[in-house]
């Protein structure tokens, strides 16, 4: 029986040109996590595998940074990055757990925010 739960940051917003950390937390299970996939709608962003490490999808290579932990830092945000993101935890023996994050990328106000965001 799958007893675990995934907690995510839920609905988040960030400014165009900035950065955001996508993070999920699996709890209430002793299952071993073997891999985490990060997906945007139907597109694979990155995979973190327990043995093989990180694989970043070529189309995101220039603006994805691995971590913190099993999370993902998405940089140089554009309004096209608005949408649903999924963390897919592959575990043994439980199976697969999926968490959902909705990211809204907002047009930055140059008057209020002159400096470019740094990675948190």
């Amino acid at each position: 029986m799958m007893t675990g739960t995934i907690e995510t940051t839920g609905n988040i917003s960030a400014e165009k040109g900035g950065s955001i950390i996508l993070q999920c937390h699996l709890s209430s299970t002793t299952a071993q996590v073997t891999q985490v996939n990060w997906e945007q709608q139907d597109q694979l962003l990155a995979i973190c595998n327990a043995d093989l490490g990180w694989h970043i999808s070529p189309s995101f290579k220039d603006r994805v940074a691995p971590g913190p932990g099993l999370g993902l830092t998405l940089q140089s945000l554009t309004v096209n990055d608005t949408g649903e993101y999924f963390c897919i935890y592959h575990t043994y023996p439980d199976g697969t757990y999926t968490g959902r994050i909705f990211l809204e990328v907002l047009e930055s106000s140059v008057a209020e925010h002159g400096a470019r965001f740094q990675i948190p």
Partner: antibody, heavy 117, light 107 residues
């Protein structure tokens, strides 16, 4: 089995710069974050930052921004940390450490840096 | 920054005893905590990841527990080779931060 071999101890004059190397073997260098950690008797273990050889991504502890610069040469599977404008506060043991599965699973043997005035 | 506090700088124990090293995070870090052992003159070595998962090759008399802000490393049936410094570390947020360490002394 991953293995990290760091460069030897350094005795450097105040105001100069130093570059510490960390040669990785036994794994795919471009698939794992390489972290750098400073250890002193007074401050304990301090995280400097990481470099991801897969795409050159970096993240620095604010405290070490402008002090340390992290790079890597993927052709030789070697990570580097340059420390500039050295002062006595920079005297420490510096470790490179490969981030494994939710921990810093493999550590170099450490490089002792002594800054003399 | 997240502060990891190991309130006990030194702990004294005897061979065969059970000892618990504690670590408190200044904010919720879920289970994103690792424990390291460092023997004199050596590099740190990971013992526990994800708060409670034993790293490969670590004896089962060493266990980790906790989530949120409070974490414990327990060593049962203490052996002389356990003489070392023990550090906790969070990897929930950058910058990664370490506890100040607890030195385990054997009576």
């Amino acid at each position: 089995q991953a293995y990290l071999q760091q460069s030897g101890a350094e005795l450097v004059r105040s105001g100069a710069s130093v570059k510490v190397s960390c040669k990785a073997s036994g794994y795919t260098f471009t698939s794992f974050n390489m972290h750098w950690v400073k250890q002193t008797p007074g401050q304990g273990l301090e995280w400097i930052g990481y470099f991801f050889p897969g795409n050159g991504a970096t993240n620095y502890n604010q405290k070490f921004k402008g002090k340390a610069t992290l790079t890597a040469d993927t052709s030789s599977s070697t990570a580097y940390m340059q420390i500039s404008s050295l002062t006595s506060e920079d005297s420490a043991v510096y470790f490179c450490a490969r981030e494994g599965w939710l921990s810093l699973g493999y550590w170099g043997q450490g490089t002792t840096l002594t800054v003399s005035s | 920054d997240i502060v990891m506090t190991q309130s006990q700088k030194f702990m004294s124990t005897s061979v065969g005893d059970r000892v618990s090293v504690t670590c408190k995070a200044s904010q919720n870090v879920y289970t994103n905590v690792a424990w390291y052992q460092q023997k004199p003159g050596q590099s740190p070595k990971v013992l526990i990841y994800s708060a409670s998962h034993r790293y490969s090759g670590v004896p089962d008399r060493i266990t980790g527990s906790g989530s949120g802000t409070d974490f414990t490393l327990t060593i049962s049936n203490v052996q002389s080779e356990d003489l070392a410094d023990y550090f906790c570390q969070q990897h929930n947020r950058y910058p990664y931060t370490f506890g100040g360490g607890t030195k385990l002394e054997i009576k």
